[in-house]
């Protein structure tokens, strides 16, 4: 007499929600006499999935006609799969007996895992901007996928990054999983136009990974370089002071002119010129009348960029000795 073998050929079955799942089971012998039942799980708390003789299993159909005399195929099909159906399914042979049939042999089991696509990755940057040469963190999140195996890569302007840490939760068995990855990026002054991309590859995506992006422009602050120039005196004792604010980002910038410590003008950057790297330049002029000055004038330009502490740049306008004499005469 040939020893009975219970064959469940698939170790793993991936099924999408709403689909039907076929769980295959064949036996190699008709003996001993007795039914084949399907269970999910093991141990005393296992769940009966199908019993041909008794019970009501509306979502389960048999692949073959179990009433046929020499039937050896006990495969079943479960319709309208839901996340609650995930688990390991066993076909189990029972030997006919009384007062109950006796469990004789179990198949090795088929794990049914839900095939669910990951959500579109969402990349979020740091809460506050940082300046070049500093490191910022970007986080990528995706959820709702199954099975657990997933691949995540980071890119900066198309170049793969290596400094990142990824976690898939939960660690144990679950209906679906989520992934969270944090990449560390060192900022460069030209990164205003740079982009980081998080790429997620999963069995459900048929080789077409999902991507989420974030612009480094949201994370970077390039502080301005400041330059003050003084144009030669014009007729009428006027001096043109030019203040050039170069290579800054973002564009919110406020400039205050102070004459001997007193505010004489405040302006917000408006007509900016954009550089190729995405940073901005801005030029501000101040016309100073020196005819009524008897002492040297200290001109200070105060720049407040993106809410940071103000940066000052001062220039001393020297009044000629002739002017000083004239003004001192006038005061006597």
């Amino acid at each position: 007499e040939e020893e009975l073998q219970m064959i469940q050929p698939e170790k793993l079955l991936l099924v999408a929600v709403g689909e039907s799942a076929t769980l295959n089971c064949t036996v190699t012998s008709l003996l001993p006499v007795g039914p084949v039942l399907w269970f999910r799980g093991v141990g005393p708390g296992r769940e009966l999935i199908y019993n041909q003789k008794e019970g009501h299993f509306p979502r389960v159909t048999t692949v073959s006609d179990l009433t046929k005399r020499n039937n050896m195929d006990f495969s079943i099909r479960i319709s309208s799969i839901t996340p609650a159906d995930a688990g390991t399914y066993y076909c189990v042979k029972f030997r006919k007996g009384s007062p109950e049939n006796v469990e004789f042999k179990s198949g090795p089991g088929t794990e049914m895992a839900l095939r669910a696509k990951p959500s579109a990755p969402v990349v979020s940057g740091p809460a506050a901007r940082a300046t070049p040469e500093h490191t910022v963190s970007f986080t990528c999140k995706s959820h709702g996928f199954s099975p657990r195996d997933i691949t995540l890569k980071w890119f900066k302007n198309g170049n793969e990054l290596s400094d990142f840490q990824t976690n898939v939760d939960p660690a144990g068995q679950s209906v679906s999983y989520s992934i969270r990855s944090t990449a560390r990026v060192v900022l460069a002054p030209w990164d205003v136009r740079s982009q980081v991309t998080c790429e997620v590859a999963h069995v459900t995506l048929q080789g077409d990974p999902l991507r989420g992006t974030a612009n480094l422009s949201e994370a970077i602050r390039v502080p301005p370089t400041l330059e003050v120039t003084q144009q030669p005196m014009r007729a009428g004792n006027q001096v043109n002071i030019t203040y050039q604010v170069r290579n800054f980002y973002p564009q919110n910038l406020q400039l205050t002119w102070l004459e001997n410590g007193n505010v004489c003008r405040t302006e917000t950057a408006s007509t900016l010129t954009e550089n190729k790297d995405g940073t901005y330049n801005w030029t501000s002029w101040l016309l100073v009348n020196t005819s009524d000055q008897r002492d040297d004038v200290v001109l200070t330009c105060q720049v407040k960029h993106d809410g940071q502490l103000a940066v000052n740049k001062s220039l001393v306008l020297e009044v000629s000795a002739h002017q000083k004499d004239q003004s001192s005469d006038a005061t006597h």
């Epitope: 005393p44 030997r95 006919k96 009384s98 007062p99 109950e100 006796v102 004789f104 042999k105």
Partner: antibody
Framework: QVQLVQSGAEVKKPGASVKVSCKAS????????MHWVRQAPGQGLEWMGR????????KYAQKFQGRVTMTRDTSTSTVYMELSSLRSEDTAVYYC??????????WGRGTLVTVSS | DIQMTQSPSSLSASVGDRVTITCRAS??????LAWYQQKPGKAPKLLIY???TLESGVPSRFSGSGSGTDFTLTISSLQPEDFATYYC?????????FGQGTRLEIK
């Protein structure tokens, strides 16, 4: 050969618990349910319950419900029967017996449990 | 629970005699009935199962019959080794139950 080897005789005080073992050999342990039957001195046979060696599922006689626990260790092909809150009426020979389709075709030699103060 | 009643409770007979023991169930057990022989200090030994099937290795002088509620065990010609206690057992439904036993003694 096909046999069931039980643990040795036990003497217990009232209120105590006893755990009897039964080691199967010579056949596929998981293909037969194991039952426990006891016999008080000079009395008949009394069915106590059974264990499914595959799943560990149990079924107990109403009389012993709450006092008896049957377990198994598939790695050693051994089943255990633990009876708690012992009283003098529990003095008996305890047998493990393999159930064929509806009959006990293989028996252990029995374990005498004496409950005495 | 299904009650199993054996009769007689004890009986004396001689070697060579034909002996019949009866077992009555309180409700039908179909043919899910077995007979066992037990000798002092030993475990029971299966003789007959499913009412009439002789267990392998059991002498053919033992036979069983009946279905539903009434069953008999017959020993056609008693041998000295047959003196023992005999039990019937039903396996139609839980709990499994045994008869109280019939003690067969030498006359």
């Amino acid at each position: 050969q096909v046999q069931l080897v039980q643990s040795g005789a036990e003497v217990k005080k009232p209120g105590a618990s006893v755990k009897v073992s039964c080691k199967a050999s010579g056949y596929t342990f998981t293909s037969y349910y194991m039952h426990w039957v006891r016999q008080a001195p000079g009395q008949g046979l009394e069915w106590m319950g059974r264990i499914n060696p595959n799943s560990g599922g149990t079924k107990y006689a109403q009389k012993f419900q709450g006092r008896v626990t049957m377990t198994r260790d598939t790695s050693t092909s051994t089943v255990y029967m633990e009876l708690s809150s012992l009283r003098s009426e529990d003095t008996a020979v305890y047998y493990c017996a393999r159930l064929g389709s509806a009959y006990f075709d293989l028996w252990g030699r029995g374990t005498l449990v004496t409950v005495s103060s | 629970d299904i009650q199993m009643t054996q009769s007689p409770s004890s009986l004396s007979a001689s070697v060579g005699d034909r002996v019949t023991i009866t077992c009555r169930a309180s409700q039908s057990v179909d043919t899910w009935l077995a007979w066992y022989q037990q000798k002092p200090g030993k475990a029971p030994k299966l003789l007959i199962y499913e009412a009439s099937t002789l267990e392998s290795g059991v002498p053919s002088r033992f036979s069983g019959s009946g279905s539903g509620t009434d069953f008999t065990l017959t020993i056609s010609s008693l041998q000295p080794e047959d003196f023992a206690t005999y039990y019937c057992q039903q396996a139609n439904s839980f709990p499994i139950t045994f008869g109280q036993g019939t003690r067969l003694e030498i006359k």
